[in-house]
């Protein structure tokens, strides 16, 4: 599907003293759907600071944010999902910037859980399966999932394998042997909805067994 | 007011290429998408393409894809929309739309005739 | 592509009643209460007009006298009292898949 919010990139800021960043969050408790807004400027004294979004609502015209330490939070189920809302930075009932945004385009998956790995000797390879809570949603239900695995001691040579499924088969021959490895996996929306990652799953670590030849069998 | 003001109407032979441009007014520009609408003669509407005025982004309708090509001047909050090859069936009124959600259209421009004849 | 099947090819419905238009998408076009259909009214050179966004909410400035309903393949758009100026071609709009294709529209007419 075409569009123009690329996933992962965050909205464009204002440039100014108070841009700021936001993510949607569809059916995160039951029916209601939340939004989150953070300053990009971690020193930015938020004192005083107010965010309101206004448009694209069902009954109300507009809602307030509740702050929770430094980041601003809404969890309604009155987002109409259709149309752009206009969500500004005020203070004492004063806009100081303003960003037009369509929340089906900000969304944020929940995190994958339940990582697991086991090992099919007869197979010779490694069974990973995850769980995610979007299989029992009615919006964001279709999600491109990322695996990234690596060997423990190699600390930035991380393997991707996208996947829309929560089952994926790694070959032991295209692991190393006797190592400890750490997988882990994260998601993001893959039809109509657009956004960013979610946050990665907790890693699991799994250790490959060592070469089993069989009498006679050269080494590779 | 919120306005989409396009170019006038042009006539062209086959082969050619037409460039008609919109100029967006009355909003902030860089905060809506820009498509193009085109309808032929009698006919109904079709849809050929976006475009993100952010970013510069597009979106096209793989109907016109290698024949089409949208740009934005945000510097005079314009959007242009290139038709290449063009055939006597490109013949239409072509629309330049503001998106005001995914992806319906609630501000439309005049229109600009496009005439292919040889 | 989607395609969208408008009925009937043309209305005429006397001043005053109701008139009725039906669009029928080949797949479904929505999730979950989500619809992403929209109705648009053209009028002889004029370009289009928005009437309806997401099959049910009426666009601002646009007469109560319109409305839209229906989910996944079945959408409709009802004038509930017909006045003249009303007479035009309706257009329904899918935008759950590139590319966003229009119905074939529908002429209204008076009787």
């Known amino acids: 599907e075409s569009g123009y919010a690329q996933n992962g990139d965050l909205e464009d800021a204002e440039l100014d003293d108070y841009s700021f960043s936001c993510y949607s969050q569809l059916e995160v408790n039951g029916s209601q759907h939340s939004l989150t807004c953070a300053f990009e400027d971690p020193d930015v004294n938020t004192t005083n600071l107010e965010f309101e979004i206004c448009g694209a609502l069902v009954e109300v015209k507009c809602l307030s944010f509740r702050k929770l330490q430094e980041i601003y939070f809404i969890e309604t189920k009155k987002f109409l999902l259709i149309g752009k809302s206009n969500i500004c930075v005020k203070v004492g009932g004063k806009s100081l910037t303003c960003k037009k945004i369509d929340l089906t385009t900000i969304v944020k998956p929940e995190a994958p859980f339940d990582l697991s790995v086991i090992y099919r000797e007869g197979a010779n390879d490694f069974v990973v399966t995850f769980n995610t809570s979007h299989l029992q949603k009615k919006y964001v239900k279709v999600l491109m999932h990322d695996v990234a695995y690596r060997q423990e001691k190699d600390e930035n040579k991380w393997m991707h394998v996208n996947l829309s499924s929560t089952k994926l088969t790694l070959l032991q021959r295209n692991l190393q042997p006797e190592a400890m490895y750490e997988i882990k996996v994260r998601s993001i929306p893959d039809h109509y909805f657009k956004g960013f990652w979610s946050e990665w799953s907790p890693s699991y670590y799994f250790r490959t067994p060592e070469i089993n030849n069989s009498p006679g069998e050269m080494d590779p | 007011q919120v306005q989409l003001v396009q170019s006038g109407a042009e006539v062209k032979k086959p082969g050619a290429s037409v460039k008609v441009s919109c100029k967006a007014s009355?909003?902030?520009?860089?905060?809506?998408?820009l498509h193009w609408v085109r309808q032929a003669p009698g006919q109904g509407l079709e849809w050929m393409g976006g475009?993100?005025?952010?970013?510069?982004?597009?979106a096209y309708n793989q109907k016109f894809k290698g024949r089409v090509t949208m740009t934005r001047d945000t510097s005079t909050s314009t959007v242009y929309m290139e038709l290449s090859s063009l055939r006597s069936e490109d013949t239409a009124v072509y629309y330049c739309?503001?998106?005001?959600?995914?992806?319906?259209?609630?501000?439309w421009g005049q229109g600009t005739t496009v005439t292919v004849s040889s | 592509d989607i395609v969208l099947t408008q009925s009937p090819d043309s209305l005429a419905v006397s001043l005053g009643e109701r008139a009725t238009i039906n669009c029928r998408t080949s797949?479904?076009?929505?999730?979950?209460?989500?619809?992403?259909m929209h109705w648009y009214q053209q009028k002889p050179g004029q370009p289009p007009k928005l009437l309806i966004y997401?099959?049910?909410n009426l666009e601002s400035g646009v007469p109560d006298r319109f409305s839209g309903s229906g989910s996944e393949t079945d959408f409709t758009l009802t004038i509930s009292s017909l006045q003249a100026e009303d007479v035009a071609v309706y257009y329904c709009?899918?935008?759950?898949?590139?590319?966003?294709?229009f119905g074939g529209g529908t002429k209204v007419e008076i009787k």
């Open positions: 475009i993100d005025p952010k970013t510069g982004g597009t």
């Open positions: 997401g099959a049910s």
């Open positions: 739309a503001r998106s005001g959600g995914r992806w319906y259209f609630d501000v």
């Open positions: 709009q899918q935008s759950i898949k590139d590319p966003y294709t």
């Open positions: 009355g909003y902030r520009f860089t905060d809506y998408e």
């Open positions: 797949e479904s076009v929505s999730i979950h209460l989500l619809h992403l």
